[in-house]
């Protein structure tokens, strides 16, 4: 019994005066608390308590469930305790089978004994299975068995408390350990699509997938720069232990333009947080934007190939595409395809393949595209570069020499005089008149140039060269002159192609 110095309040005294008492099932428990300031008896087992205001605690026929700690308390708050074991061979353990363990922490298997004199108080696996090799425990007959540093691998471990009684192993009811994992990484979050494009009134629905070790992970959809509570629906699955998946679906049943913005799926646990975003763009009506991939004015050499390429954004998806030239629709020679196979793709490519173009095939080539909301078009002006062709070369009645050439770009005509029999005509002659003839004609055809010189300027026999040229090539025509007396006459005009 406790001893204190006189004058100081002392704890109550209990009879019988021992710390532990063993009684047999069916026997009487009689405990007397002696204290001038007696307040109450408290009985506690498996962390449950009962009180008694009588100073003598009497249980006429003891049962195993009367096993526990009996505490007498006085008015000074001082107390004294005795632990009573009610030995019942048929009920060696008192149990509370709720068994939760937090990873890396200790947890108590609550199976206190009713008989302290049994031996080998320990834990055993169910169905004769061994316990994990690294499982360590500390038995306490009055409380149960403490498992040290719970591991994730112990989740749903089936256990019995076990003792040896008269040489036989006796097992308690089964305990199933539920381990709450410690978060050792941030949640993994992903979103069904990174961006959405909708028309007003259409439904916006996006799903965020959150993966973590347990359902304790927190997740929410947030609108960036907004505190508005968003409506979400959840589905969740446990794919085995510590592999939890949640799908959080955000829905706006009828999207409006002002719903456009960035939506964040945010998840956190005690280790940290993670997020992923998706962008919503709501337009009042559909659109088509066309982007030429080459200049819309195209120059191509005669006989060469050219590809007219456009990229275009179309929402909703394009329904009709066509290429047109001179009011005729191409049935082949073109292809149209999405820029990406991505589900959210709105960008497309259209290519018209023009092969071995002739000088007569210049003109306006138009790409037209439409969807359910809008039409759009883009025109390419195609110019076919052709080397000059000398259409006419004549000596006119007024004594002028005239050369007419056609080509694209517009040819330049130069005149040269070669005295006598020289092959090289280097002396240039200035034209009297130069005209572009068909500027009022079709815009993409060859350009026709007329140039004239005065033949009276030539006093000797020789050859006059009319040379028409542009970026593509050159062509020449020749006038041969011979003087017979005072008369000059033109002999054998002929052309000579010079590449």
């Amino acid at each position: 019994q406790p001893s204190v110095s006189p004058g100081e309040p002392s704890p109550p005294s209990i009879h019988p005066g021992k710390s532990d008492l063993i009684v047999r099932v069916g026997d009487e428990i009689r405990l007397l608390c002696t204290d001038p300031g007696f307040v109450k008896w408290t009985f506690e087992i498996l962390d449950e308590t009962n009180e008694n205001k009588q100073n003598e605690w009497i249980t006429e026929k003891a049962e195993a469930t009367n096993t526990g700690k009996y505490t007498c308390t006085n008015k000074h708050g001082l107390s004294n305790s005795i632990y009573v074991f009610v030995r019942d061979p048929a009920k060696l353990f008192l149990v509370d089978r709720s068994l939760y363990g937090k990873e890396d922490n200790d947890t108590l298997v609550r199976c206190p004994l009713t008989d302290p004199e049994v031996t080998n108080y320990s834990l055993k696996g169910c169905q004769g299975k061994p316990l994990p090799k690294d499982l360590r425990f500390i038995p306490d007959p009055k409380a149960g068995i403490m498992i040290k540093s719970v591991k994730r691998a112990y989740h749903r471990l089936c256990l019995h408390c076990s003792v040896d009684q008269e040489g036989k192993s006796v097992l308690s009811e089964k305990f199933i350990l539920k381990v709450r994992p410690a978060f050792k990484a941030v949640p993994v979050v992903s979103v069904s699509k990174a961006s959405y494009l909708l028309r007003e009134g259409e439904e916006f629905t996006v799903t965020c997938t959150i993966k973590d070790v347990s359902s304790s992970v927190y997740s929410t959809w947030k609108r960036e720069n907004s505190q508005t509570k968003l409506q979400e629906k959840y589905n969740s699955w446990h794919h085995g232990d510590f592999n939890y998946e949640r799908q959080a679906t955000l829905t706006i049943s009828s999207a409006r333009v002002n719903d456009s913005g960035v939506f964040m799926c945010y998840a956190n646990n005690t280790f940290g947080s993670a997020n992923v975003t998706t962008t919503l763009e709501v337009v009042d009506k559909g659109f088509i934007n066309i982007f030429p991939m080459i200049n819309t004015t195209v120059f191509v050499n005669d006989g060469e190939n050219v590809d007219l390429i456009v990229e275009y954004e179309a929402f909703p998806k394009p329904e009709h595409q066509q290429w047109i030239y001179m009011n005729r629709t191409f049935t082949d020679k073109w292809e149209d395809y999405p820029k990406s196979e991505n589900e959210s793709n709105i960008r497309y490519v259209s290519e018209l393949h023009l092969t071995r173009l002739k000088g007569t095939e210049g003109g306006t080539y138009t790409f037209l595209v439409s969807n359910s909301d809008v039409n759009a078009a883009i025109a390419f002006n195609v110019y076919v570069n052709t080397k000059p062709e000398i259409l006419t070369y004549d000596r006119l009645v007024n004594g002028m020499l005239q050369c007419v050439a056609a080509g694209f770009p517009e040819p330049t005509i130069d005149w040269y005089f070669c005295p006598g029999t020289e092959q090289r005509c280097s002396a240039s002659v200035l034209p009297v008149d130069v005209q572009t003839l068909n500027s009022s004609g079709p815009p993409f055809g060859k350009l026709v140039v007329q140039s004239s010189i005065d033949s009276s300027a030539f006093k000797h026999n020789g050859t006059v060269e009319c040379k028409a040229y542009n970026d593509v090539g050159k062509t020449s025509a020749y006038f041969n002159f011979a003087f017979k007396g005072n008369n000059k006459e033109q002999i054998h005009p002929h052309t000579l192609f010079t590449p």
Epitope: D47, D96, R156, I176, R180, H238
Partner: antibody, heavy 117, light 111 residues
């Protein structure tokens, strides 16, 4: 004997918060998990979450995540459940329940929370 | 989450009748042969009261006319002979894994 006594009925405006208390007696408060369950008028029972014994960590039903917080005051053996951003859908009777031997062996008497403009 | 579906949703019976209520889980609630399924009784304006725990164990103080059976996904609550005080709503509940879930309830009425 074990008793769970809850705080009285509350009337709240939409958008407000409510904090329901559950005072425990008859057992060692820190040794048992405390769960919260609610029941809307004429409806069934819905588990809201649990505050575990020992470390006092919590696990919430995702439906209430971000709005619910469960705490304890061990000095008074009282558990608390706070629910924020209330709407009319949160009108319900809220119960605390002690988990004992794998089941909800003890329940509080319930606290009616009415959310009304 | 594990979804519990009770049937019937409501039931009319007379005093002395034998009544059976079933509860089906969307997945097994068993761990090592232990079924984490419980049954509760609730009367209007009162808190639920535990009747049966771990599928078949009678809670202390509950009359023996109540019994539970089943394992895995299919469970049954049986009242062998209805008494007037048994007219109430009955719920099954699983705590194999979180979130813990309840059945939608079976209302037992007097015929």
């Amino acid at each position: 004997q074990v008793q769970l006594v809850q705080s009285g009925a509350e009337v709240k405006k939409p958008g407000a918060s409510v904090k329901v208390s559950c005072k425990a007696s008859g057992y060692t408060f820190t040794s048992y998990n405390m769960h919260w369950v609610r029941q809307a008028p004429g409806q069934g029972l819905e588990w809201m979450g649990v505050i575990y014994s020992g470390q006092g960590d919590t696990s919430y039903n995702q439906k209430f995540k971000g709005r619910v917080t469960m705490t304890t005051d061990t000095s008074t053996s009282t558990a608390y459940m706070e629910l924020r951003s209330l709407t009319s859908d949160d009108t319900a009777v809220y119960y605390c329940a002690r988990e004992r031997d794998t089941r909800f062996g003890n329940w509080g008497q319930g606290t009616l929370v009415t959310v009304s403009a | 989450e594990i979804v519990l579906t009770q049937s019937p949703s409501s039931l009319s019976a007379s005093v002395g009748d034998r009544v059976t209520i079933t509860c089906r889980a969307s997945e097994s609630v068993d761990i090592y042969g232990e079924s984490f399924m419980h049954w509760y009784q609730q009367k209007p304006g009162k808190a639920p009261k535990l009747l049966i725990y771990l599928a078949s164990n009678l809670e202390s103080g509950v009359p023996s006319r109540f019994s539970g059976s089943g394992s895995g996904t299919d469970f049954t609550l049986t009242i062998s002979s209805l008494q007037p005080e048994d007219f109430a709503t009955y719920y099954c509940q699983q705590n194999k894994e979180e979130p813990y879930t309840f059945g939608q309830g079976t209302k037992l009425e007097i015929k």
